[in-house]
């Protein structure tokens, strides 16, 4: 779809008469009337198959015509098609001079034609504006035309249709050819896949919009690249989703078993040592001078008995010294290494005690890790999910999510292409090794049948007497061309009467 | 045990503001991404906000996007919700909530409510 | 925004009663499902999560079972307790949704 566009610039008529030599009086009142055509090597008489426009007289014997596009005039003169323009055309325009105010052919004496000119080529679609000048014996025209594109309509014929458009099914504008060009921010054939945040993690997030990084299940911050623990876990942090490591001090499965009151709770006073005996429990050993539970109270040196588990109170000018017996350290001889008896095994491991009770090991039954049992043992460590699937380490069946175009336990089978029905009205699909083909039904185009195309209203032969079809895709009808002697809209008729337009 | 104390909740007129706060024990705070989460009188729940634990980063439902902030100071254990140019229907039970948009919300408060009307 | 449709919106049951109640997603959620309680004046509790995974401390009578689009919460022998405001919530996709809610009265 397009526009022939003719733009009358001059016209000489120095005389003021007509084709016939004749004066016109008072002056010739000239206007124009324009056929365009298919191309003819001998420009003959017969249909305008392009169009026809005719111009308000413009002037009178000799005028120069006023660009009047910008103020919703008629010049450039607008002809329009609605078919691939075929690059060649004939041209005929005629000159006329207008006695009274009704310019139509009926109304018109036979000999007021003052000027005809026909012209025939090869044209190009194109902003640039070919300049023309004919010249007759008692006339001259000046004038430029050229053939652009409708709007949405691109390519060499004007032929390929492209709508710009920022919706769900494509964010894009066109390209002079007539190739979609993304908008910013979005990717693919059509333009509706996002390019998510720059650094966003290919497996763990996902974007609806450009520049986001929504996270998958499991997953938190702006890139999408650290964990979220348990929902149980209490003070515990995670390596992937859904673990619960626990901080220091802090045991059992969701991290809620206080190993460490000393440190969380601060209890005993005086500036008194600490030391955990057990979950919730703990020893405070007091300074020289102070004695109770919680060294609250004051006393003397090494009458308090400072020294913890067996340990002797040596005094000294500064204080006092605790000697410890083995298997203790520490200020007040208050640190012991864990052993079995504290039940430090989580999970059903069992312990056993090495090196003569000093330290012991713990052994982890099926699906549990880590020196204490406190892990659980991860399913996706060995990643076993091909072509990219997501690797999920919960849930009672499914391990893995596929990416699309996949399925089975471990993403390992393609899904047919063809299983979502890609191919629009109607279109039968065909999966091919790497991706897919639409046959479409007759009227439809393009990859995936979604673009309609016109059917050829000239393939039933509907003209008659050797006559010339030309389809109307817009309309998806036909115009026949008739051979000499011949009329109608399928030149049926031999001629018998005039033709109502006078070529 | 996990305890979640929400605060700050009362009648606002149309166009004002309002700042929520959440004291957050008995778990690291540190570690989790938290959210908000409110319910109309009489209606159903309805995710407002969320923030990551690793990093701050912040979600908004679309109708609060622009008037609400979530923010969080770990070192007090609290989060915050900033509510300004509040509207007749921001009116509802706000709770705050252990979570991120794409996992359970295991903990809530006992819920602060917010009353926009003139 | 994914869709949640609970089913029904109010149901009556006795004591004893097998109950069960249903969360229809509009599209596929995989198993990234949680139900949530929640008492007249008092915040939701999470009962399960990932679907059939019961939360700590919740009683094992509670049981939750689908995958994709469909799920059930199943409550095997009512307790008075139990009577409350039941809420299906997906967080597979951003913004994380709620069901409309189903209310379990006593009959």
């Known amino acids: 779809s397009g526009v022939f566009q003719l733009q009358l610039q001059e016209f000489i008529n120095e005389r003021g008469v007509l084709a016939s030599g004749r004066p016109c009086e008072p002056g010739c009142r000239t206007f124009f009337r324009v056929c365009l055509k298919h191309f003819q090597a001998v420009v003959s008489p017969g249909p305008c198959t392009f169009g026809t426009v005719s111009t308000p007289v413009l002037g009178t014997n000799s005028f120069a015509v006023r660009d009047d596009s910008s103020g919703g005039g008629r010049n450039p003169l607008q002809l329009p098609f609605n078919f691939t323009w075929p690059g060649t055309f004939s041209l005929i325009i005629e000159a006329w001079h207008a006695p009274g105010d009704d310019l139509r052919p009926e109304a018109l004496p036979p000999d007021a034609l003052i000027s005809k000119i026909a012209i025939q080529g090869s044209l190009a679609v194109g902003q640039n504006w070919l300049l023309d000048e004919q010249t007759s014996t008692l006339t001259r025209l000046r004038y430029s035309y050229r053939v652009i594109c409708s709007d949405n309509y691109y390519g060499d014929n004007c032929s390929r249709l492209c709508k710009k458009r920022n919706d769900h099914f494509g964010h894009y504008v066109c390209q002079p050819d007539g190739n979609l060009s993304c908008l910013p921010g979005w990717t693919g054939e059509y333009c509706q896949q996002p390019i998510c945040l720059s650094g966003c993690h290919e497996q763990n997030g996902y974007c609806s919009k450009p520049a986001e990084c929504l996270c998958r299940p499991g997953w938190q911050g702006r890139l999408c690249n650290e964990c979220i623990p348990h929902n149980g876990c209490r003070h515990g942090t995670c390596s992937t989703p859904w673990q619960c490591t626990c901080d220091e001090g802090w045991g059992g499965l969701f991290c809620d078993q206080d190993l460490n009151y000393c440190t969380h709770h601060s209890p005993c006073k005086n500036g008194a040592t600490c030391s955990n005996s057990g979950q919730r429990s703990y020893t405070c050993t007091c300074r020289p001078g102070y004695t109770g539970v919680d060294c609250e109270l004051e006393l003397s040196e090494c009458d308090s008995n400072p020294c913890r588990n067996g340990g002797s109170c040596k005094d000294q000018e500064d204080g006092y010294h605790c000697l410890c017996p083995p298997g203790y350290y520490g200020l007040h001889c208050e640190h012991s290494t864990l052993s079995c008896a504290d039940s430090p095994c989580f999970n059903g491991g069992s312990c056993r005690e090495r090196n003569q009770g000093a330290n012991y090991a713990c052994e982890c039954p099926p699906n549990f890790t880590g020196s204490n049992c406190e892990k659980k043992v991860d399913r996706c460590t060995s990643n076993p999910c091909a072509n990219g699937g997501q690797c999920l380490n919960r849930g009672p069946s499914r391990m893995c999510r596929c990416r699309p175009g996949f399925t089975g336990t471990y993403c390992e089978l393609h899904v047919s292409d063809c299983a979502r029905n890609p191919c629009a009205h109607g279109g039968t699909c065909h999966d091919l090794e790497n991706g897919l083909m639409c046959t479409c039904p007759a009227g439809f185009s393009g990859r995936r049948c979604e673009v309609r195309t016109s059917i050829d209203a000239c393939a039933s032969s509907p003209c008659f007497n050797r006559a010339t079809c030309y389809t109307d895709l817009s309309t998806d009808t036909f115009v026949c061309n008739c051979p000499y002697g011949f009329v109608g809209s399928r030149c049926e008729f031999p001629v018998g009467l005039p033709p109502s337009f006078p070529w | 045990e996990v305890q979640l104390v929400e605060s700050g909740g009362g009648l606002v007129q149309p166009g004002g503001s309002l700042r929520l706060s959440c004291a957050a024990s008995?778990?690291?705070?540190?570690?989790?991404?938290m959210a908000w989460v409110r319910q109309a009188p009489g209606k159903g729940l309805e995710w407002v906000a969320t923030?990551?634990?690793?990093?701050?980063?912040?979600y908004y439902r679309d109708s609060v996007k622009g008037r609400f902030t979530i923010s969080r100071d770990n070192a007090k254990n609290s989060l915050y919700l900033q509510m300004n140019s509040l509207r007749a229907e921001d009116t509802a039970v706000y709770y705050c909530?252990?979570?991120?948009?794409?996992?359970?919300?295991?903990?809530w408060g006992q819920g602060t409510l917010v009353t926009v009307s003139s | 925004d994914i869709q949640m449709t609970q089913s029904p919106s109010s149901l009556s049951a006795s004591v004893g009663d097998r109950v069960t109640i249903t969360c229809r997603a509009s599209?596929?959620?995989?198993?990234?499902l949680a139900w949530y309680q929640q008492k007249p004046g008092k915040a939701p509790k999470l009962l399960i999560f990932?679907?059939?995974d019961l939360a700590d401390g919740v009683p094992s009578r509670f049981s939750g079972s689908g995958s994709g689009t469909d799920f059930t919460l199943t409550i095997s022998s009512l307790q008075p307790e139990d009577f409350a405001t039941y809420y299906c919530?997906?967080?597979?996709?951003?913004?994380?949704?709620f069901g409309q809610g189903t209310k379990l009265e006593i009959k």
């Open positions: 909530a252990r979570g991120y948009y794409n996992s359970p919300f295991a903990y």
């Open positions: 008995g778990f690291t705070f540190s570690n989790f991404p």
């Open positions: 923030i990551s634990s690793s990093d701050g980063t912040t």
């Open positions: 599209q596929d959620i995989y198993i990234n």
């Open positions: 990932d679907t059939s």
């Open positions: 919530q997906q967080y597979d996709y951003y913004p994380p949704t």
